[in-house]
């Protein structure tokens, strides 16, 4: 269920869940928001100061990197 994640616990979870995609500590500008002036929401606010579940955590994964053929 939802839990608070701070410090190393948060980095561990992001690394495991996001894997090759990597992750952001702040959602990219405009991510999930229609207003350019909306304050950025950070993962620390969402997952450390409040509890967050796995799906919330996944929102901070970076987009897929288009890997080129070797």
């Amino acid at each position: 269920g939802p839990e608070t994640l701070c410090g190393a616990e948060l980095v561990d979870a992001l690394q495991f869940v996001c894997g090759d995609r990597g992750f952001y500590f702040n959602k990219p500008t405009g991510y999930g928001s229609s207003s350019r002036r909306a304050p950025q929401t950070g993962i620390v606010d969402e997952c450390c100061f409040r509890s967050c579940d796995l799906r919330r955590l996944e929102m901070y994964c970076a987009p897929l990197k288009p890997a080129k053929s070797a």
Epitope: E3, A8, A13, C18, G19, R21, L54, A67
Partner: antibody, heavy 118, light 106 residues
Framework: EVQLVESGGGVVQPGRSLRLSCAAS????????MTWVRQAPTKGLEWVAY????????YYRDSVKGRFTISRDNSKNTLYLQMNSLRAEDTAVYYC???????????WGQGTLVTVSS | DIVMTQSPDSLAVSLGERATINCRAS?????MHWYQQKPGQPPKLLIY???KLASGVPDRFSGSGSGTDFTLTISSLQAEDVAVYYC?????????FGQGTKVEIK
């Protein structure tokens, strides 16, 4: 050198419980998140469970949620998997694993066999 | 979950010949990772990041591909390469492996 040694496997009847252990050495155990991966003859390799370095965060594959509990004792450099309400489909070799970023599932123990059979 | 499908399930190749294993993901992934498992041993990381060789892996192994289709190639099969090979995706949670490809000597 990273060493992971699993124990606690065996033959158990459906519905019963078993606790697996994994003794870690050769690295700073408390700095690494850990996972269990299992290998059943019919299902190949399956990630089972994850626990963060401090033990405060855990994730499970859907088929074991509510039945399995991953935990760790950083003072003993040991990882655990408590398996309750075991089913025939849980029969597998269970591996303790860890990884570095990009080197996913880079380190494995030798595995311990769990057989669920009546 | 992303489903990983390897082909073929098994292949027999003559010593010194090329062996090619394919892995297809049900959705696009950033990279593919490959593991080698010899009888009675745990899997061993072989190739990471689609094409990078893990430490100590001979250069007869190579990886390529992008999107949903990836390939592991053994350019000149040696006796010690007899094993089961697995692909892994780590672009989407949860991590998922292919079903494995058994490589034997013809």
């Amino acid at each position: 050198e990273v060493q992971l040694v699993e124990s606690g496997g065996g033959v158990v009847q459906p519905g019963r419980s078993l606790r697996l252990s994994c003794a870690a050495s050769g690295f700073t155990f408390s700095n690494y998140y850990m996972t269990w991966v299992r290998q059943a003859p019919t299902k190949g390799l399956e990630w089972v469970a994850y626990i963060s370095s401090g033990g405060g965060s855990t994730y499970y594959r859907d088929s074991v949620k509510g039945r399995f509990t991953i935990s760790r004792d950083n003072s003993k450099n040991t990882l655990y998997l408590q398996m309750n309400s075991l089913r025939a489909e849980d029969t597998a070799v269970y591996y303790c694993t860890t990884e570095d970023y990009g080197y996913w599932f880079a380190y494995w123990g030798q595995g311990t066999l769990v057989t669920v059979s009546s | 979950d992303i489903v990983m499908t390897q082909s073929p399930d098994s292949l027999a190749v003559s010593l010194g010949e090329r062996a090619t294993i394919n892995c297809r993901a049900s959705s696009s992934v950033s990279y593919m990772h490959w593991y080698q498992q010899k009888p009675g041993q745990p899997p061993k990381l072989l190739i990471y990041g689609t094409s990078k060789l893990a430490s100590g892996v001979p250069d007869r192994f190579s990886g390529s591909g992008s999107g949903t289709d990836f390939t592991l190639t053994i350019s000149s099969l040696q006796a010690e390469d007899v094993a089961v090979y697995y692909c892994l995706q780590r672009s989407s949670y949860p991590p998922t492996f292919g079903q494995g490809t058994k490589v034997e000597i013809k």
